[in-house]
């Protein structure tokens, strides 16, 4: 009778095992082992027992001990089970960004691994098991579908293999794939809202605001603002699920014409874009030309208003005749015209909008001096010892200097509060003088003494 020890062995792939073949008869004609594995016999005393070292065991094998005794031939098999963990545990590649609400199929592929009966494939989200299945086929494939939720953002999905050899007295061998980090996002179907001037003047700055609600995660949204080829540099402020991107846009004469303003929001692998046209125009303020800004009374003055060739002007509220970019008026300068404003208003239509520009010039009329009865009375009668304020106003431009002297030596304190004395009585010569000339006027002060009352 032939026997083998051990009758069952589990060993790692490529490992070695000692197998003892024994027979019950004392003098066997033959005792050996039949195996394709590399073997080495260990020398032992006696004839009825042999020990072999079987090496480089790569797969399950059933070496067979045999013996030939006088009472006949017999055999005994030992069962070698090879174990090894999978060579590849991999999640099928997926885009890292996934829109919320999409069904996401996770596919795990496992190559190798034995014994397959003890090999299980587990799909996980973090530490939570999503699916557990035995490894079947080569490569083994396990799939599961996940409905992408907002709270999955940043979650790690992985695949784990478990080779459970604990029933065989060994341990549980685990292999885990590289994790797949899921980035979830929500990009609404509505395009971003773009607020900007429809028209923009050359050499000015405009403000462009692009905003969108209902984004997740809002901090990951990329905003691209551009006017034509000019990339804008916005300042972005974020809300819980919204953003607002504000940028200043400067335009020059080179940008004149119709330009395309774009706002693109990129989140995950999706984008939303809004386009708008902006008309860039040049419209200098109209020019108000006075023949001379400062003239003497009685001078003929021409006031001209000139504007952009396509503009329509009004000068002091009067439209140009015919309606167009030029207007003019003529006047003879009077003192009342001093300080008079000549205002030219120009209107230009740009992309359906009316743009208004104004320019104002002031006329200075030099006149005078003047001294008249109304502002410089010729006669004052005041009681002695009373408090009085002599008033005499000279008019003119420039404002004349005024002095009132009695006998060429005594000044009358114009505009000052004086105590009336007999010294104040008399006739004063008031002289108003400016660069425009000189006028004189006599003013008499009468003092009423108490004895005359």
């Amino acid at each position: 009778q032939t026997s083998v020890s051990p009758s069952k062995v589990i060993l790692p792939r490529g490992g070695s095992v000692l197998v003892t073949c024994s027979t019950s008869c004392d003098q066997p004609k033959l005792l050996g082992i039949e195996t394709p594995l590399p073997k080495k016999e260990l020398l032992l005393p006696g004839n009825n027992r042999k020990v072999y070292e079987l090496s480089n065991v790569q797969e399950d094998s059933q070496p067979m001990c045999y013996s030939n005794c006088p009472d006949g031939q017999s055999t005994a098999k030992t069962f070698l089970t090879v174990y090894w963990t999978p060579e590849r545990v991999e999640l099928a590649p997926l885009p890292s960004w996934q829109p919320v609400g999409k069904n996401l199929t996770l596919r795990c592929q496992v190559e190798g691994g034995a014994p397959r009966a003890n090999l299980t494939v587990v799909l996980l989200r973090g530490e939570k098991e999503l699916k557990r299945e035995p490894a079947v086929g080569e490569p083994a494939e396990v799939t599961t579908t996940v409905l992408v939720r907002r709270d999955h953002h940043g979650a790690n999905f992985s695949c784990r293999t478990e080779l459970d050899l604990r029933p065989q007295g060994l341990e549980l061998f685990e292999n885990t794939s590289a994790p797949y980090q899921l980035q979830t996002f929500v990009l609404p179907a509505t395009p971003p809202q773009l607020v900007s001037p429809r028209v923009l003047e050359v050499d000015t700055q405009g403000t462009v605001v692009c905003s969108l609600d209902g984004l997740f995660p809002v901090s990951e949204a990329q905003v691209h603002l551009a006017l034509g080829d000019q990339r804008l540099n916005p300042t972005v402020t974020y809300g819980n699920d919204s953003f607002s991107a504000k940028a200043s846009v400067s335009v020059t004469a080179e940008d004149e014409g119709t330009q395309r303003l774009t706002c693109a929001v990129i989140l995950g692998n999706q984008s939303q874009e809004t386009l708008q046209t902006v008309t860039i125009y040049s419209f200098p303020a109209p020019n108000v030309i006075l023949t001379k800004p400062e003239v003497s009374e009685g001078t003929e003055v021409t006031v001209k208003c000139e504007a952009h060739p396509r503009a329509k002007v009004t000068l002091n509220g009067v439209p140009a005749q015919p309606l167009g970019p030029r207007a003019q008026l003529l006047l003879k300068a009077t003192p009342e015209d001093n300080g008079r404003s000549f205002s030219c208003s120009a209107t230009l239509e740009v992309a359906g909008q009316l743009i208004h520009k104004n320019q104002t010039r002031e006329l200075r009329v030099l006149y005078g001096p003047r001294l008249d009865e109304r502002d410089c009375p010729g006669n004052w009668t005041w009681p002695e010892n009373s408090q009085q304020t002599p008033m005499c106003q000279a008019w003119g431009n420039p404002l004349p200097e005024l002095k009132c002297l009695k006998d060429g030596t005594f000044p009358l304190p114009i505009g000052e509060s004086v105590t009336v004395t007999r010294d104040l009585e008399g006739t004063y010569l008031c002289r108003a003088r400016s660069t425009q000339g000189e006028v004189t006027r006599k003013v008499t002060v009468n003092v009423l003494s108490p004895r005359y009352e």
Epitope: E401, K403, D407, G408, T409, F410, P411, L429, R433
Partner: antibody
């Protein structure tokens, strides 16, 4: 050009009489007042008096009686008569255009002055 | 009678100093006050009229202020050419007066 030029100064004996002249040009005496100011050696300015455009005269209280201001519009000349000069009348005498004429800004127009020395 | 009182009578200053001279009238002369500068052997030079108006050609470091009875002449930064005697003169009344001028202030080098 507006100018004033004093003359008539020099050495005079106490108790005698002296008349200083002031010739003006560039303006009319009929419309301007003219005054006299003196300055004793090492002393301050002292106002003597003024003749108005109407020929009326005004004097400092100490000058009344011994000092007389007059003018001749046709000759465009103003005069200062000093009666009974005393040693304390020794001074430089300035003829000045009115103290506050319109636009002429106070004693703006001064002559170069004429020195009167009262000594026996 | 209107009397004019000037102070101080003498004032010592260094080049660059700020100098202030005051003039007081015994009754209101409104703004009818002039200031003069006189150097030895020369006729007085007109500086300021109407209390604060600068006569033509006068440097802007000179300024005048005041009205009524109190007046001030200020030299913001005294220059070597400014060492002289300064007089105020009232130009309001030519009647019943002793002297239209203040007693003078001599500004000398410290």
């Amino acid at each position: 050009e507006v100018q004033v030029l004093e003359s008539g100064g020099g050495l005079v004996q106490p108790g005698g009489s002296l008349r200083l002249s002031c010739a003006v040009s560039g303006f009319s005496l009929s419309s301007h007042a003219m005054g006299w100011v003196r300055q004793a050696p090492g002393k301050g300015l002292e106002w003597i008096g003024i003749i108005g455009s109407s020929d009326r005269t005004y004097y400092a209280s100490w000058a009344k009686g011994r000092f007389t201001i007059s003018k001749d519009n046709s000759k465009n000349t103003v005069y200062l008569q000093i009666n009974s000069p005393r040693a304390e009348d020794t001074a430089v005498y300035y003829c000045v255009r009115d103290p506050y004429d319109s636009y002429d800004e106070g004693y703006r127009l001064w002559g170069q002055g004429t020195l009167v020395t009262v000594s026996s | 009678d209107i009397q004019m009182t000037q102070s101080p009578s003498t004032l010592s200053a260094s080049v660059g100093d700020r100098v202030t001279i005051t003039c007081q009238a015994s009754q209101s002369i409104y703004r009818y006050l002039s200031w003069y500068q006189q150097k030895p052997g020369k006729a007085p030079k007109f500086l300021i009229y109407d209390a604060s108006k600068l006569a033509s050609g006068v440097p802007s470091r000179f300024s005048g202020s005041g009205s009524g009875t109190e007046f001030t002449l200020t030299i913001s930064s005294v220059q070597p050419d400014d060492f002289a005697t300064y007089y105020c003169q009232q130009a309001y009344s030519s009647g019943s007066i002793d002297n239209a001028f203040g007693g003078g202030t001599k500004v000398e080098i410290k």
